[in-house]
């Protein structure tokens, strides 16, 4: 499955939108930094079949979409930017879903790569727990925004490697 060129442009647009979403000076949030334990090894792309990598990417985008679709997220970010960001993620999910079906067939996808998908889910659980503990403060969201930018960059790099394998 070849992800369309518009997919990588969508990645870039999503990162730009996320960068634009900042509302407070990040410098005031230094003490709120937190180790979310991003599962970097799941995104190095070496040990995966293409289908497995796509399923992990899909989970990453899905969880990001879920995180930024909550009521708490709506209260934290400028609405039009948030909507544009969600739209970009939604389009990426559609592209990746089409690819997953093409690569492995519908029957196999739920069983694929469960450990990696679980690692991504636990990572997002840690992010949600952090936000809850910090009472969804502006700085907590700022730290999470920085973290998601970093993790989406890893996702983008994995997608680039997948395209080079084609």
């Amino acid at each position: 499955c070849d992800l369309p060129q518009t997919h990588s442009l969508g990645n870039r647009r999503a990162l730009i939108l996320l960068a634009q979403m900042g509302r407070i000076s990040h410098f005031s949030c230094l003490k709120d930094r937190h180790d979310f334990g991003f599962p970097e090894e799941e995104f190095d792309g070496h040990q995966f079949q293409k289908a497995q990598a796509i399923s992990v990417l899909h989970e990453m985008i899905q969880q990001t979409f879920n995180l930024f679709s909550t009521e708490d997220s709506s209260a934290a970010w400028e609405q039009s930017l948030l909507e544009k960001f969600s739209t970009e993620l939604y389009q990426q999910l559609n592209d990746l879903e089409a690819c997953v079906i093409q690569e492995v067939g519908v029957e196999e996808t739920p069983l694929m790569n469960e450990d990696s998908i679980l690692a991504v889910r636990k990572y997002f659980q840690r992010i949600t727990l952090y936000l809850t503990e910090k009472k969804y403060s502006p700085c907590a969201w700022e730290v999470v925004r920085a973290e998601i930018m970093r993790s989406l960059s890893f996702s983008t790099n994995l997608q680039k490697r997948l395209r080079r394998k084609d």
Epitope: A19, L30, D32
Partner: antibody
């Protein structure tokens, strides 16, 4: 390979202006902040300030606020430190270093080679 | 501002010695402390970040510990290339601040 390359040594007279540079390569320049650190001859390290090149937001140490200006041009992956009127006491080695911002990652993991600024009449 | 106080300011040691440098913050900084090594005429080099994480490529004889206000850098067996000045730096809040440095010299 990540690199921060600083501009060359400068010899200036008191009252003159100066702008030194720090060019980043081998990484996404806007994903990291750039900090500036002063080291006067035979002395320790002093943090001066920092910039987020993605939006040019800055923070300064109170000791350096109003004395220097930090800026960045993300189109050429370069951060700057400038003085409008140098003093003899500005004579020092100046280092730039990258900072991961709000991410949980090593602070100041890569440094420039330093720019020696000498101010003398 | 958070003040960082290192001790000792200098020490003499021999190759193979275990060396300990301490750093104290004027208020709690959780675990947001970094250690750097600097040799004459060179830029500082990050050794330890977030109090105890060893920076990639740094020998395992270097270790860091502590949290709150009291921190320690330990060199388990001093090597000839370890003679340098060491700085702690709080990474908890702006303005970032460094300790005054500890010079490790050959006995």
């Amino acid at each position: 390979e990540v690199q921060l390359v600083q501009s060359g040594a400068e010899v200036k007279k008191p009252g003159e202006s100066l702008k030194i540079s720090c060019k980043g390569s081998g990484y996404s320049f806007t994903s990291y902040w750039i900090g500036w650190v002063r080291q006067m001859p035979g002395k320790g390290l002093e943090w001066m300030g920092i910039i987020d090149p993605s939006d040019s937001d800055t923070a300064y140490s109170p000791s350096f606020q109003g004395q220097v200006t930090i800026s960045a041009d993300k189109s050429i992956s370069t951060a700057y430190l400038q003085w409008s009127s140098l003093k003899a006491s500005d004579t020092a080695m100046y280092y730039c270093a990258r900072h991961p911002g709000l991410n949980w990652a090593p602070d100041f993991d890569y440094w420039g080679q330093g720019t020696l600024v000498t101010v003398s009449s | 501002d958070i003040q960082m106080t290192q001790s000792p300011s200098s020490l003499s040691a021999s190759v193979g010695d275990r060396v300990t440098i301490t750093c104290r913050a004027s208020q709690s900084i959780d675990g947001a402390l970094n250690w750097y090594q600097q040799k004459p005429g060179k830029a500082p080099k990050l050794l330890i970040y977030f109090a105890s994480s060893l920076q990639s490529g740094v020998p395992s004889r270097f270790s860091g510990s502590g949290s709150g206000t009291d921190f320690t850098l330990t060199i388990s067996s001093l090597q000839p290339e370890d003679f340098a000045t060491y700085y702690c730096q709080q990474a908890y809040d702006f303005p970032l601040t460094f300790g005054q440095g500890t010079k490790v010299e050959i006995k």
